[in-house]
Structures are given as structure tokens and as C-alpha cells.
Interface confidence: medium
């Protein structure tokens, strides 16, 4: 079960001549929304073919009025995502039908009418949990500009929304053969089969029959430190005598990257990080502002001061990179204390702890006051590895059994005489002070200064502190 | 198995009021509208309200604007019409439907027939004066 979620960024004219002015007809206003079909699979499916997957409509737009005079401005549109839900597996293969409609508001014999502008039809693989793909296409002279994904949601987790994870309230309901779903700890799964001889400690698999290894680690079964591999930073094919890789094409290569932007390596693939203006797998789409909604994870754009910074994208915490596309690894700053495994969540750092510790960066040593009473009613506060404990008045020392004068911190105020007394002291004020501490000067006809002495105490009278 | 089943028609006063109820079953129910018509004997069918569920957009004859609301239940797939200040030109068979616009159609009419692909049996509404 998951949803499939389409934004809408732009509808408008397209570039070139002979674009339309307007969405409307001569016979008045109108305004615009969009229907979203999708169907299992990249074939040529008939075009009557039904919405297997499932189908979605936007809400209506705001009213458009064309302006003849005026240059033609950007078309309102619906406000929100369309949410296309599906029960069954993902199908990773898909193809999208993007519907641009107008509902013509002038008089219509029959009711009002709806006419369709654009209907645009993409193919597309996509993989469930996957970022936001983004897409411009042209439908005659229109031009849509839209990002979409595909996400799990219930228990469903998986490139295609099939694994199930089992929700727990206690570490002890993931069974025998259970591990934390990643990432979000708080469910279980059973995880996959890892090729045989794969190193428990040091390797991990997220498909059947693999072997991926920590970060440290190499080789087949991830049995290697990678200090001592001689093949290490190689890539190619195997060698026959020596087992390492030989040197081979890098992804990066040739940089493909376009317009100043730098490569990196991923695993099989590579990733541009494009300057300001430019965006798309190799930063090949330029001219962006933020009316194309330049600003992925919920980045607030702001446009740039200079013709060279067309937009600037402010970044949520978290996130990162001109257009906030990349995570940020919060982990590698290792927020969790008394060596916790740090969890970065996207929405949040969860750390989980190790026995015997806990608090939300495993600060707390749970063990620190196990067995270890303060005495003279202190209360016992762990913490760093040592208990401590925060004594009752008139106690003292590491676990409180010592006793102490409450009156040698000097508490009373103005000349007052401090005596201690078995619920702590008392101040025996000095004339023409008053209060727990002797801290209010009493004025000459009687009357405090500030609040009034308690009933059945004159000025003057030893005030007990309570 | 598509299945749409009316309720609540019967016999009112002028001024009066009813509530008709469709229950959609077997319908992938969020993605199209579901709308009310009705048919006079020896007239056309005509639409009266529809609704889009998963936006809520509503449409209402100029005939029906003021008197007749239509409402949604999508916990129970149900679609409702309250139909207030009843007239006898109101009398009438009204017939819940389920559609929306034809996947290739250029041009869409969300008040009449063509495109609602599901029909109820009926209930009959009659209205004396």
C-alpha cells in the first residue's frame, strides 16, 4: 500500500511562436485544474484503457479572466498535491497520464463544461521511497512542468511497497529473526537472506543473495578490512592473478556534469551537485526561478539579487545543496553519547541506545544510581557515568550523610542573625527588616516596603523559612 | 462488481423535504464523481448535483441551486441529496450515477449522462400539492 503523489509547478504557454495567450476561450472565464491516471506497466496500452493503478483529481483553480492588453501572466493554479492512493504492490514500471482541464464558467447550454487543453504521457520506472523525479513536457503549445513520486505508507515498506513491517512497542516483540526496520526503529521485519558466508559483523544485506559491506570492510563476504586491501579506491574488472579490481572507467570521468557542475561518485552511478540556475540529472535544465519550484523538501525559495542567482533556496534542517536535494548526514557529527547508533529519520535524529543507558542521545547511565541510596531523604540524579545526589536542607556530601550548616552561606540579609532550625534556618531580623531573608526594609510608620509580614508576625519577629 | 443503491425517495408535501442516500459498492470510489438525476416520465434525464469526492467539487442545475445540497461520506461510500422546499415539477424517478470524464474525451458536460458508466435502479420522488 502506498500513495502516488504528483506537484504541479507550472502550466503555461510554451516557448516559440504561436503560443496561446490564453487557456480560455472567447466566451469568458474559466479556470484550470488536472487529472492524473496512472496504468501498470510501459506498453502502449490503449488510450480507454482504465486507471488500473488508480486516478486523481485536483481542485479547481482560481478564476481566470484573459486581459487582451495585457501580457499574458502565469496561470493560477490548484493549490496541493495530487494524491493518487494504491493498495497493491508498487509496480516500479508505470505510465503517468497528466490531464490539463478548463471549466468554462460563461453560460453553457447543458451546464457547465469542461474542456481538456493538454494531456501529456510518460513511461517511467520509479522506485517507491525514492526522491522527487522531476519532469517538463510539452503537449502541443503548452508546457507542464511537475515532480512526482511514489511512497509507502501503513507497515509497507520497499522499493515496491511489499515488505511489511510489523509495528512494536518494546524491543523485546522483535522475535527470533527479527531486526529494526530501517529507519524507523520502532517496527520490525524479517530481513533478507544475505549470500552465504556473509560476514555478520561487517557485512548487511537489502536483497536476497547480496553482500554489501560496512563502511572499513571489503571483499566478496566483506571479511577484508579495507586498510589491508591491496585492490582498494580500484574499480574495473577482477583480475585473474592477483584478485583485485584493475583500474577501469569511473562514472565521473569525462565529468558529466554541465554547466560547472561537480560530480561524485554513488554506487554504480554518479551525482551532480549543480550550481544556482541549473538543475536535472547532468544540471542540463537552466533558466529556473522560483516559479518552477526549484526547492525539493520543502526549501523555501527566495529570488536571487543578481541575474546570476536567478532563485536561492533556504534549506530545512536537514537538508542541503543549491536546490536542497541532498540529506544531510546528521549522524556524522555522532550526536549519540556512550556509543548509542545514531538513526537520522529525515524528519528526526533518533539515537538507539546501548543497555544500560538511555535519554534521547543515550546521555542517562541507567545503572548510575542502581543500588546507590542518598541518605537523609537526598534524591539520587545519574548522569556521565556517576551518580549524584541532591541532598535535602541541612545535609551534605556525596550521598548526603553529612551535616550541613545551612547558616554558613551567610543567608540572612541586612545584620539579620541566622539560627539553624531542624527544617532548615531562621533569621532573627535586625530592626527595620523583615522577610524570610531580612530582605524588605520596613518603612517608619510600620508598612513593608514590599509584601506585608503574614498574620500573627510583627516587623521584627524572627521569620521562619519554611 | 460495480453496485450503486438508492434510498429514502417517497412521497412529500409541497415545501416539504427528503434525504436520498447512494451507497457505492465494489468502486474505486475517490477518483470519479457520483451524481443525482432524475427523469419525469416523457422527459429526459437530467442532471441535478454531482460531487467529486476526492476534492469535493460540486455541480448543481440552475433548477436545483439553493433547494438541494448534495454531501459525501467517504468513510461509508455514501453520497447524499437533502432536497428542501420540494416543488411538484420535483416529482420525478432519481437515479444515482458514477463516472467522470471518458478517457479520451476532449469535452466533458459533469451534469449530463455520457460518462457516468454505473446507474442505480431508482427511487421514485413524488411531490403533491
Known amino acids: 500500500a502506498g500513495v502516488f503523489e504528483l506537484q504541479i509547478h507550472s502550466f503555461g504557454p510554451g516557448p516559440g511562436p504561436g503560443a496561446p495567450r490564453s487557456p480560455c476561450s472567447a466566451r469568458g472565464p474559466c479556470r484550470l485544474f488536472f487529472r492524473v491516471c496512472l496504468k501498470p506497466g510501459l506498453s502502449e496500452e490503449a488510450a480507454e484503457s482504465p486507471c488500473a493503478l488508480g486516478a486523481a483529481l485536483s481542485a479547481r483553480g482560481p478564476v481566470y479572466t484573459e486581459q487582451p492588453e495585457a501580457p499574458a501572466p502565469d496561470l493560477p493554479l490548484p493549490n496541493g498535491l495530487l494524491q493518487v492512493p494504491f493498495r497493491d504492490a508498487w509496480p516500479g514500471t508505470f505510465s503517468l497520464i497528466i490531464e490539463t482541464w478548463r471549466e468554462e464558467l460563461g453560460d453553457q447550454i447543458g451546464g457547465p463544461a469542461w474542456s481538456l487543453l493538454a494531456r501529456v504521457t510518460r513511461r517511467r520506472r520509479l522506485a517507491a521511497g525514492g526522491p522527487w523525479a522531476r519532469d517538463i513536457q510539452r503537449a502541443g503549445a503548452w508546457e507542464l512542468r511537475f515532480s512526482y513520486r511514489a511512497r509507502c505508507e501503513l507497515l509497507a515498506v520497499g522499493t515496491a511497497c511489499t515488505r511489511l513491517c510489523r509495528p512494536r512497542s518494546a524491543p523485546s516483540r522483535c522475535g527470533p529473526g527479527l531486526r529494526p526496520c530501517a529507519p524507523l526503529e520502532d517496527e520490525c521485519e524479517a530481513p533478507p537472506v544475505c549470500r552465504a558466508g556473509c560476514s555478520l559483523e561487517h557485512g548487511f544485506c537489502e536483497q536476497p543473495g547480496e553482500c554489501r559491506c560496512l563502511e572499513g570492510w571489503t571483499g566478496p563476504l566483506c571479511t577484508v578490512p579495507a586498510s589491508t586491501s591491496s585492490c582498494l579506491g580500484l574499480r574495473g574488472p577482477s583480475s585473474a592473478t592477483t584478485g583485485c579490481l584493475v583500474p577501469g572507467p569511473g562514472p565521473c570521468d569525462g565529468n558529466p556534469c554541465a554547466n560547472g557542475g561537480s560530480c561524485s561518485e554513488t554506487p554504480g552511478s554518479f551525482e551532480c551537485t549543480c550550481p544556482r540556475g541549473f538543475y536535472g540529472l547532468r544540471c542540463e535544465v537552466s533558466g529556473v526561478t522560483c516559479a518552477d519550484g526549484p526547492c525539493f523538501n520543502g526549501g523555501l525559495c527566495v529570488g536571487g539579487a543578481d541575474p546570476d542567482s536567478a532563485y536561492i533556496c533556504h534549506c530545512p534542517p536537514g537538508f542541503q545543496g543549491s536546490n536542497c536535494e541532498k540529506r544531510v548526514d546528521r549522524c556524522s557529527l555522532q550526536p549519540c553519547r556512550n556509543g548509542g547508533l545514531c538513526l537520522d529519520l529525515g524528519h528526526a535524529l533518533r539515537c538507539r541506545c546501548r543497555a544500560g543507558f538511555a535519554g534521547p542521545r543515550c546521555e542517562h547511565n541507567l545503572d548510575d544510581c542502581a543500588g546507590r541510596a542518598c541518605a537523609n531523604g537526598g534524591t539520587c540524579v545519574e548522569g556521565g557515568g556517576a551518580h549524584r545526589c541532591s541532598c535535602a536542607l541541612g545535609f551534605g556530601g556525596r550521598d548526603c550523610r553529612e551535616r550541613a550548616d545551612p547558616c554558613a552561606a551567610r543567608p540572612c540579609a541586612h545584620g539579620g542573625r541566622c539560627y539553624a532550625h531542624f527544617s532548615g534556618l531562621v533569621c532573627a531580623c535586625a530592626p527595620g527588616y523583615m522577610g524570610s531573608r531580612c530582605e524588605f526594609p520596613v518603612h517608619p510608620d510600620g508598612v513593608s516596603a514590599l509584601p506585608a509580614a503574614p498574620p500573627g508576625l510583627r516587623p521584627g519577629d524572627p521569620q521562619r523559612y519554611l | 462488481q460495480v453496485h450503486l443503491m438508492e434510498s429514502g425517495g417517497g412521497s412529500v408535501q409541497a415545501g416539504g423535504s427528503l434525504r436520498l442516500s447512494c451507497a457505492a459498492s465494489?468502486?474505486?470510489?475517490?477518483?470519479?464523481?457520483m451524481g443525482w438525476f432524475r427523469q419525469a416520465p416523457g422527459k429526459e434525464r437530467e442532471g441535478i448535483a454531482t460531487?467529486?469526492?476526492?476534492?469535493?467539487?460540486?455541480y448543481y442545475a440552475d433548477s436545483v441551486k439553493g433547494r438541494f445540497t448534495i454531501s459525501q461520506d467517504n468513510a461509508k461510500n455514501t453520497v447524499y441529496l437533502q432536497m428542501n422546499s420540494l416543488k411538484p415539477e420535483d416529482t420525478a424517478m432519481y437515479y444515482c450515477?458514477?463516472?467522470?470524464?471518458?478517457?479520451?474525451?476532449?469535452?466533458?458536460?459533469?451534469?449530463?449522462?455520457?460518462?457516468?458508466?454505473?446507474w442505480g435502479q431508482g427511487t421514485q420522488v413524488t411531490v403533491s400539492s
Open positions: 460531487i467529486h469526492s476526492g476534492v469535493a467539487t460540486t
Open positions: 450515477a458514477a463516472g467522470g470524464p471518458p478517457a479520451n474525451a476532449d469535452r466533458w458536460y459533469p451534469l449530463r449522462p455520457p460518462g457516468y458508466n454505473y
Open positions: 465494489g468502486y474505486t470510489y475517490r477518483s470519479n464523481f
